[in-house]
């Protein structure tokens, strides 16, 4: 039902859903700190613009009695319960920040009259694509998929002279929320990735993955998986790997690869790591001193959600426009605003754009090195290292099908 919004007469409220089920197991206190830091910045920006208004956040906590798995599995109903709570209390703000689980976001979007914008730190799944009033501030699965297809097709680089059309995808069901939806998108038979590939098989058992590494009859040399190096080691150990195997390790929210003292372990030599361009910076910020890299990205997305709201509020107020309108609800897209860590660009569908980085392990230095970058905004790959010191023969990525090209 339609809920009146606390969003006029110089007082603008943000409803922040503090859900027990979350994309990342982050103490809610850290998210509160991020939101509060964002509010301070927004107030300063509005003041600078000569806008004498009040901006506050209301934190809506679920009771945690029923929905207490802590991960996203029971988030569908929790999101709706929180919305019901808001409705009963007549305390809807100008914007809703919070649902990070794909299940909860999808259901909330489906079951409510969304005349207000929703900002999510997460909601990675394809089912949350192309939602008119939803903004996602962490890279969704669609962006990953477009990179992979772009990279598979690339055949004009010194280190990649073959187009690929095949892949294995390792997905065993124990993944983190981001990985679950990234791999889910690759698995889906109707997805862009599946449409563009000639062969794709999902490996669900550890043994299946381990067997492929030396199987002479494998149908592809390329295996996509999601997680960190430790996850790969647990699975692969020190097993021998055929020389033309390429493992693509998707580990977007982990900037540890860029730290000066990091040495790549030997088991990473057949691996290309896909991650995001590092922020190199949040270690000293007040809300993130004690956070792991992934959780820094999560808290940062909350903070940036507040800054995005401030950005849009400022524009609308300067133009003398009403905030409680469909126009405002649909405006959180196709723009760049100043985030906490620098400019943040949202695409036509309100999804954050970023620079993805593909790393390889140098056989000379045992360091991670940047092979190429990919700008999700323009769907374009930019080679960085034209003469990589690969483990693969002739310092070129092998063909994806055994028996063709360098072995």
């Amino acid at each position: 039902s339609q809920v009146s919004q606390n969003c006029h007469n110089g007082s603008y409220e943000i409803s922040v859903l503090m859900m027990g089920n979350s994309a990342f197991a982050e103490p809610l206190k850290n998210l509160e700190d991020a939101v509060n830091e964002g509010l301070e910045i927004v107030r300063g920006r509005l003041q600078n613009a000569g806008l004498n208004v009040t901006v506050n956040a209301t934190f809506m906590y679920s009771d945690g009695l029923i929905h207490n798995s802590g991960d996203c599995r029971s988030s569908t109903c929790e999101g709706l319960d929180l919305l019901r709570k808001i409705s009963n209390a007549q305390r809807m703000g100008c914007v809703l920040i919070g649902p990070s689980c794909t299940y909860s976001t999808f259901q909330m979007y489906l079951d409510t009259e969304l005349s207000y914008p929703m900002i999510s730190a997460g909601s990675f799944g394809l089912s949350c694509d192309y939602k008119e009033t939803l903004t996602r501030l962490m890279s969704p699965a669609r962006k990953l998929m477009y990179f992979l297809v772009n990279f598979w097709k690339t055949n004009d680089l010194p280190f990649k002279t073959y187009s690929w059309s095949t892949s294995y995808v390792y997905k065993n069901g124990t993944e983190t929320e981001d990985c679950f939806w990234y791999l889910n998108a690759l698995e889906a038979s109707v997805s862009y990735f599946s449409h563009e590939l000639g062969f794709k098989v999902v490996l669900r058992q550890d043994k299946e993955f381990q067997d492929i590494l030396m199987d002479h009859n494998r149908k592809s040399n390329v295996i996509i998986m999601c997680g960190g190096p430790e996850f790969l080691y647990k699975l692969k150990g020190d097993r021998a790997v055929a020389e033309d195997i390429v493992i693509i390790l998707v580990d977007l929210f982990n900037d540890q690869y860029f730290e000066d003292n990091v040495t790549a372990p030997d088991y990473m030599k057949n691996v290309l790591v896909l991650t995001l361009s590092p922020g190199n910076s949040l270690l000293n910020s007040s809300f993130s001193r004690n956070l792991s890299p992934t959780k820094r990205d999560f808290a940062l997305a909350y903070l940036n959600g507040i800054l995005l709201f401030g950005h849009m509020l400022k524009i609308f107020l300067e133009n003398g426009e009403n905030i409680t309108t469909p126009k405002f609800a649909h405006a959180f897209r196709n723009l760049t605003f100043e985030g906490y860590d620098g400019p943040v660009t949202l695409d036509d569908w309100g999804d954050v754009d970023s620079t993805m980085v593909l790393l390889y392990t140098s056989v000379d230095t045992k360091k991670y090195k940047v092979l190429l970058t990919y700008d999700t905004h323009v769907n374009k790959t930019y080679p960085v290292d034209m003469s990589p010191t690969f483990t693969w023969k002739n310092s070129k990525l092998p063909n994806d099908i055994t028996g063709r090209g360098p072995q």
Epitope: I41, Q47, D341, G342
Partner: nanobody
Framework: EVQLVESGGGLVQPGGSLRLSCAAS????????MGWYRQAPGKQREMVAA???????EYADAVQGRFTVSRDNAKNTVYLQMNSLKPEDTAVYYC?????????????WGQGTQVTVSS
């Protein structure tokens, strides 16, 4: 009121160093990333370096590895350490909120500080 006061410029030989300072009013400093800009005679003003609220830094290709931007939150001051200076670094240097902040923020500029690199 927005106030930006740059200092530290001067005449220096090629290969030399300078450290520029910019004292900003707290309402700007605490709300935005800060950028250093420069304008050479007859040229457009260009951004040289930026430091965002988180402390993350960015540099123009021409100064990467030679210039370092930093901020002191207690003093509302942003610095630009310039090493290995070249004649083409000669310009008036300004500080202000970094892009892509609304242009309304950057309508106020300080007087700048002149940097001349010459033997």
């Amino acid at each position: 009121e927005v106030q930006l006061v740059e200092s530290g410029g001067g005449l220096v030989q090629p290969g030399g160093s300078l450290r520029l300072s910019c004292a900003a009013s707290s309402n700007i400093f605490r709300a935005y990333g800060m950028g250093w800009y420069r304008q050479a005679p007859g040229k457009q003003r260009e951004m040289v370096a930026a430091i965002w609220l988180s402390g993350r830094t960015e540099y123009a290709d021409a100064v990467q590895g030679r210039f370092t931007v930093s901020r002191d939150n207690a003093k509302n001051t942003v610095y630009l350490q310039m090493n290995s200076l070249k004649p083409e670094d000669t310009a008036v240097y300004y500080c202000n909120a970094g892009p892509p902040t609304a242009t309304s923020v950057r309508q106020y500029w300080g007087q700048g500080t002149q940097v001349t690199v010459s033997s």
